[in-house]
Each structure stands twice: as structure tokens, then as C-alpha cells.
Interface confidence: medium
């Protein structure tokens, strides 16, 4: 069974998938469609790197531009370095500016909904 066929079998169970499962899927050439990606738990998507999302979505990564204002894509963008987002070649904006440090202050983030940044 190839990655695409495997994905079809597990698609209906993915809504509640944890980050670890999504990271594992990104290594299996599954080409997750955007409709499924948009239904994933935001907290599971946020830790994914740009490279992992690109591998997870395959050709569908090109559709992220259309979803950049919607969750979980919007929140995921806010967590990525702008330099990394730029490598996708999709014109996604809103990432962490180059030179900023991201502090993983869970309480701060829980209150504000955004990561705490320290300027250069």
C-alpha cells in the first residue's frame, strides 16, 4: 500500500491526531489534502516545521496561500520564522521576523494566543 492509499484509509481518523502522528505522516508521502489539514487540531499543527508541512501536504502545499487567514494555517504561520516561510515560495506573510528570539512561555502564549518575541 502506498502513502496515498494509506492516507485514504486513515483520513477520517485524523481530526484528533497528535503532533507526533502528523510528523510521522509527513515522512510517508501521503499528500494530505487541504480540507483534511484545515480540520486538524491547531495545537497539533503548531509545532510542525515548514519542511514537515511541505512534506505532509505534497502538491497541496501550494494551496496554503488561499488559507493563510484561516485556522490552523494562520496560527501556524505566526509560529514560523519568516525566512522559513519564504522558502515555500507562496508569499505567506506574518511569520517571526529574522533576528527575533522565540521564548516558549506557555502561560504568556495561553493568555495572548501568540508567542512571546524578543527583538534583535
Amino acid at each position: 500500500m502506498n502513502g496515498s492509499e494509506y492516507f485514504v484509509k486513515i483520513q477520517s481518523f485524523l481530526g484528533g491526531a497528535p503532533t507526533e502522528d502528523l510528523k510521522a505522516l509527513s515522512q510517508q508521502n501521503v499528500s494530505m489534502d487541504l480540507a483534511t489539514f484545515m480540520k486538524l487540531r491547531t495545537d497539533a499543527v503548531l509545532p510542525l516545521t515548514v519542511a514537515e508541512v511541505q512534506k505532509l501536504l505534497g502538491p497541496h502545499v501550494e494551496g496554503l496561500k488561499a488559507e493563510e487567514r484561516h485556522r490552523p494555517v494562520r496560527d501556524w504561520i505566526l509560529r514560523q520564522r519568516q525566512d522559513d516561510l519564504d522558502t515555500l515560495g507562496l508569499g505567506l506573510q506574518g511569520g517571526i521576523p529574522n533576528g527575533y528570539l522565540v521564548l516558549d512561555l506557555s502561560m504568556q502564549e495561553a493568555l495572548s494566543g501568540t508567542p512571546c518575541l524578543l527583538g534583535p
Epitope: 492509499e5 485514504v8 489534502d33 502538491p59 501550494e62
Partner: antibody, heavy 120, light 107 residues
């Protein structure tokens, strides 16, 4: 208005290489991936690969993987497709087409096509 | 690779009559399908995306349906300008693949 202007027709000998250009205008070149599709006489359309204009990263159809190279010149908003070790079966019209422009998947815009004839 | 199989190979239609083209994918592609029309001597032009959505400027006599592996393009009333070769294409996974085409002619 989106425009894709390709280089002119080419006649090549078997074993040679050809490099076709595609100059894009009317949209942000680095925000949409550029794809190349070819059509041999009387044959179906055949996807060759694509390029991320921001990073230069590419995906290729395995059928062409060792012979095709897709590149970009960001400053000139131009994509290139080079095919090496040409054989008679490579005689075809080659098209460039960006994907997902205007947030809609599919190839909504195509270049005018470049006829490459391989003949001894 | 996902193989896209179109039927029929050709279609001869009286103006004003309907036409229907089928496209079958060798594996599930969801609704990640587009349809194109290639008129003689021209580049392909996009008609339908996501299986059933018309691109702007495409007449409403064109409609698409289907999901999974079976898809259909319908022309409610064929006009002279609709002649050409129609292609389906999947963009569900790499490599992107096209159907073999259906040639539509006017009787």
C-alpha cells in the same frame, strides 16, 4: 493580467540539450510555483515537474528525473526548463503554467507553448 | 502513478444537445480534479477545478461532478465553440497526471 511568454521553437539533434524559457508578468512571480507540462503529437498532456521560485527547490516526474532541470531567475521573473539527452520521442510542445493562482487549484494560465523538434 | 482514464475517446454532438465525458482515477483522489479544453492549435484552457467549481468566465453550460475515483464533465448544450479535446487532471499527488483526452466534434 497574467501573462506567460515562452521562448521560440527549437530544432535539436538527438543527444543534444534544449533550454526553454518562460517569462511571467501580471502577478507576484515568487508567490506561485511554476510547472512544466509537455504534449507530444497526438499524446496526452504530461507533467514534467515544478519549481518553487522563491527557494529554487523543485519536484520532478520520475520519468524525466535524470534529464530535466527546472530553474528560475527571480530578478527576471523567468522560469527555465532544460531537457538533456534528447531523443525523437521528446518532440513535443512544452508549456509553462503556474498552479493555484488566485487561490484556485489547477492550471488557470498557460504559456503559448514552445515546439521542440528532435530530428537527425 | 495515478492513471486517469477518460471515456469516450471521441464524441460527435449535434449543436444544442448535451454531452458527457467520464474520467476514472486508478486510486482515490478526493475532489482534486481539474478539467481543461484544448482547442485546435491553442494552449489548454481551464474549465473546472476541485471537481465541480467553474473558473471565472467559464459558461454555466459546463458542469463537473464526482469524487473519489469517478468524475464527469457535462456540457448541457454543446455549441460550435466547444470543439476540441477535453482533459481531466489530478493534482492529488505527485506526479500530477492527465487523462488521455476526449475529442468533441460537432455533427
Amino acid at each position: 493580467e497574467v501573462q506567460l511568454v515562452q521562448s521560440g521553437a527549437e530544432v535539436k539533434k538527438p543527444g543534444a540539450s534544449v533550454k526553454v524559457s518562460c517569462k511571467a508578468s501580471g502577478y507576484t512571480f515568487t508567490s506561485y510555483w511554476m510547472h512544466w507540462v509537455r504534449q507530444a503529437p497526438g499524446q496526452r498532456l504530461e507533467w514534467m515537474g515544478n519549481v518553487n521560485p522563491s527557494s529554487g527547490g523543485s519536484n520532478y516526474n520520475e520519468k524525466f528525473k535524470n534529464r530535466v532541470t527546472i530553474t528560475v531567475d527571480k530578478s527576471a521573473s523567468t522560469a527555465y526548463m532544460e531537457l538533456s539527452s534528447l531523443r525523437s520521442e521528446d518532440t513535443a510542445v512544452y508549456y509553462c503554467a503556474p498552479h493555484y493562482i488566485g487561490s484556485r487549484p489547477g492550471f488557470a494560465y498557460w504559456g503559448q507553448g514552445t515546439l521542440v523538434t528532435v530530428s537527425s | 502513478d495515478i492513471v486517469m482514464t477518460q471515456t469516450p475517446l471521441s464524441l460527435s454532438v449535434t449543436p444544442g444537445q448535451p454531452a458527457s465525458i467520464s474520467c476514472k482515477a486508478s486510486q482515490n483522489v478526493g475532489t482534486n480534479i481539474a478539467w481543461y479544453l484544448q482547442k485546435p492549435g491553442q494552449s489548454p484552457q481551464a474549465l473546472i477545478y476541485s471537481a465541480s467549481y467553474r473558473y471565472s468566465g467559464v459558461p454555466d453550460r459546463f458542469s463537473g461532478s464526482g469524487s473519489g475515483t469517478d468524475f464527469t464533465l457535462k456540457i448541457s448544450r454543446v455549441e460550435a465553440e466547444d470543439v476540441g479535446v477535453y482533459y481531466c487532471q489530478q493534482y492529488n499527488s505527485y506526479p500530477l497526471t492527465f487523462g488521455g483526452g476526449t475529442k468533441v466534434e460537432i455533427k
